[in-house]
Interface confidence: medium
């Protein structure tokens, strides 16, 4: 366990940037920070979640720009933006820092919110060593920054780990707890015995491997337990043979502000009460003005620093602060073995060969398995498919019969013959055409430009 | 590249509604603030309402209050200005603008007319 920390040292254009504020809004505006820590060093979607957790800082100073003043040293919000993590450091991280205005009112009143800047830096960094500096470009800004990871006692360690104690191994009074407290200097590993217990064993030698009260076995692993007492821990009463309640992760109940303590394996876990959130529910005064809702999440109650806050999340976001994007892809949404992306403002299919759609639902091959009937041909093209259906067929296989004069295609009362390369029209007598649709002019010259040669006025007309 | 289109406008007799849509691509479009001004002939372009990037905030001008309601559907990167009880001084071109800290971006219009 332990907490990584993030101090904002300045935040403006950076050099060579357009010289203007970050607080150019059209009325009083405010600074805030976000700071996201997902493990590893992958590329990830901004909007997935922070799996190392996250944590807002306070708003900063209001400030309202001068007309033609020159901008000054901005207001940022004072102190260290903590992320506390509960298990291993994992030394290669990614850091998200985003910077956002608070519009506090404009001709059209109220708080809005922009992401001034997002960067992200791919580390590695011990737990326990120095404050690291960064600075990070975004776009035309400059922000400048130092952090940290440090581990919180008992973990120590490049991974926070290691559980440390005390270098003099002190033996119990009548209470039956340890009664040194933790010290700095730690057994440096690996002085025990190879496989000796971090829980429930220590030594003072190298190579040895004794056992806390307890425990015993050659590594300390068996716990010591009589019929009579089985299940309970601690060190054995001299009088009765059974395990007395010894010290647990719990004890003296480590979490603050009403939180309620569950032990984990070698550690505890505090379930927070709403308006409390930390390893041990020690932050708080986060009220629904402090924007503590992420995604578009709806805060509401929380109106002052003791009254509590709740998220309502959009469709999609899940967690106490909506921070949490759900899993779209899990639903498996994309067809034919289309790979799903879930970018945050929407779901992608990157589809396989051969398939296209939003959903990859579209076969760009499926005339290779598909028949036109009565000697129609397919059709691909556009991501669908069609059947090009011979004369006198149609429908989408070409399987229905089609009669060409169903639809009186022959115009001023002229006779419509099925034909099995078409339809002929025979026209009534003043009219021409394929489907009778010239005129015959009294003169004896039709409207048509120019009659194909060898035919007369009145004759049938093939319409291909 | 970068594309705004303002749809849904038209003629619409007083007391009417529409509703104008607008579509984005080729930028990242939940994390802009988005306005919608509108310009009448022989005025100036005036902003009717906003909403933030997460949409969890929207401000209206006084002259639109009560009667539009601005929303965001930032999986289909649209925005929508829904226009109830339309009076005739509400005949303008209507613009939509995706705003932030670094860039600008606008539509070519949409024609709302209101008139019997």
């Known amino acids: 366990a332990g907490v990584f920390e993030l101090q904002i040292h300045s935040f403006g254009p950076g050099p060579g940037g357009a010289p203007r504020s970050p607080y150019s809004a059209r009325g009083p505006c405010r600074l805030f920070f976000r700071v996201c820590l997902k493990p590893g060093l992958s590329e990830e979607a901004a909007e997935s979640p922070c799996a190392l957790g996250a944590a807002l800082s306070a708003r900063g100073p209001v400030y309202t720009e001068q007309p033609e003043a020159p901008a000054p040293d901005l207001p940022l919000p004072n102190g260290l933006l903590q992320v506390p993590f509960r298990d291993a450091w994992p030394g290669t991280f990614s850091l998200i820092i985003e910077t956002w205005r608070e519009e506090l009112g404009d001709q059209i009143g109220g708080p809005a919110w922009s992401l001034l800047a997002r960067v992200t830096r791919r580390r590695r960094l011990a737990a326990g060593g120095p404050w690291a500096g960064d600075i990070q470009r975004a776009g035309a800004w400059e922000l400048r920054f130092s952090y940290r990871a440090r581990c919180e006692l008992p973990a120590v360690g490049t991974a926070c780990t290691r559980l440390c104690r005390p270098r003099s191994a002190s033996r119990c009074g009548p209470g039956l707890r340890p009664c040194a407290p933790l010290e700095d200097e730690c057994e440096a590993p690996p002085v025990c015995r190879a496989g000796c217990s971090l829980e429930h064993g220590f030594c003072e030698q190298p190579g040895e491997c004794r056992c806390l009260e307890g425990w015993t076995g050659p590594l300390c692993m068996v716990p010591v337990s009589t019929s009579s007492c089985l299940g309970l821990r601690g060190p054995s009463s001299t009088t009765t043979g059974c395990l007395v309640p010894g010290p647990g992760p719990c004890d003296g109940n480590p979490c603050a502000n009403g939180g309620s303590c569950s032990e984990t394996p070698g550690s505890f876990e505090c379930t927070c009460p709403r308006g409390f959130y930390g390893l041990r529910c020690e932050v708080s005064g986060v009220t629904c003005a402090d924007g503590p809702c992420f995604n578009g999440g709806l805060c509401v109650g929380g109106a002052d620093p003791d009254s509590a806050y709740i998220c309502h999340c959009p469709p999609g976001f899940q967690g106490s602060n909506c921070e949490k994007r759900v899993d779209r892809c899990s639903l498996q949404p994309c067809r034919n073995g289309g790979l799903c992306l879930d970018l945050g403002h929407a779901l992608r299919c990157r589809c396989r060969a051969g398939f296209a759609g939003p959903r990859c639902e579209h076969d760009l091959n499926d005339c290779a398995g598909r028949a036109c009937a009565n000697g129609g041909t397919c059709v691909e093209g556009g991501g669908a498919h069609r059947c090009s259906c011979a004369l006198g067929f149609g429908g989408r296989d070409c399987r229905e019969r089609a009669d060409p004069c169903a639809a009186r295609p022959c115009a001023h009362g002229g006779r419509c013959y099925a034909h099995f390369s078409g339809l002929v029209c025979a026209c009534a007598p003043g009219y021409m055409g394929a489907r009778c649709e010239f005129p015959v002019h009294p003169d004896g010259v039709s409207a048509l430009p120019a009659a194909p040669p060898g035919l007369r006025p009145g004759d049938p007309q093939r319409y291909p | 590249q970068v594309q705004v289109v303002e749809s849904g406008g038209g003629l619409v007799q007083p007391g009417g509604s529409l509703t104008l849509s607008c579509a984005a691509s080729?930028?990242?479009?939940?994390?802009?603030?988005v306005n919608w001004y509108r310009q009448a002939p022989g005025k100036e372009r005036e902003k009717v309402a906003r909403?933030?990037?997460?949409?969890?905030?929207?401000n209206y001008a006084n002259s639109a209050k009560g009667r539009f309601t601005l929303s965001r559907d930032n999986a289909k990167n649209r925005v929508y200005l829904q226009m109830n009880n339309l009076k005739p001084e509400d005949t303008a071109v209507y613009f939509c603008n995706f705003e932030r800290f670094d860039s600008n971006y606008w539509g070519q219009g949409t024609q709302v007319t209101v008139s019997s």
């Open positions: 909403i933030s990037s997460t949409g969890t905030t929207t």
């Open positions: 080729g930028f990242d479009f939940s994390t802009y603030t």
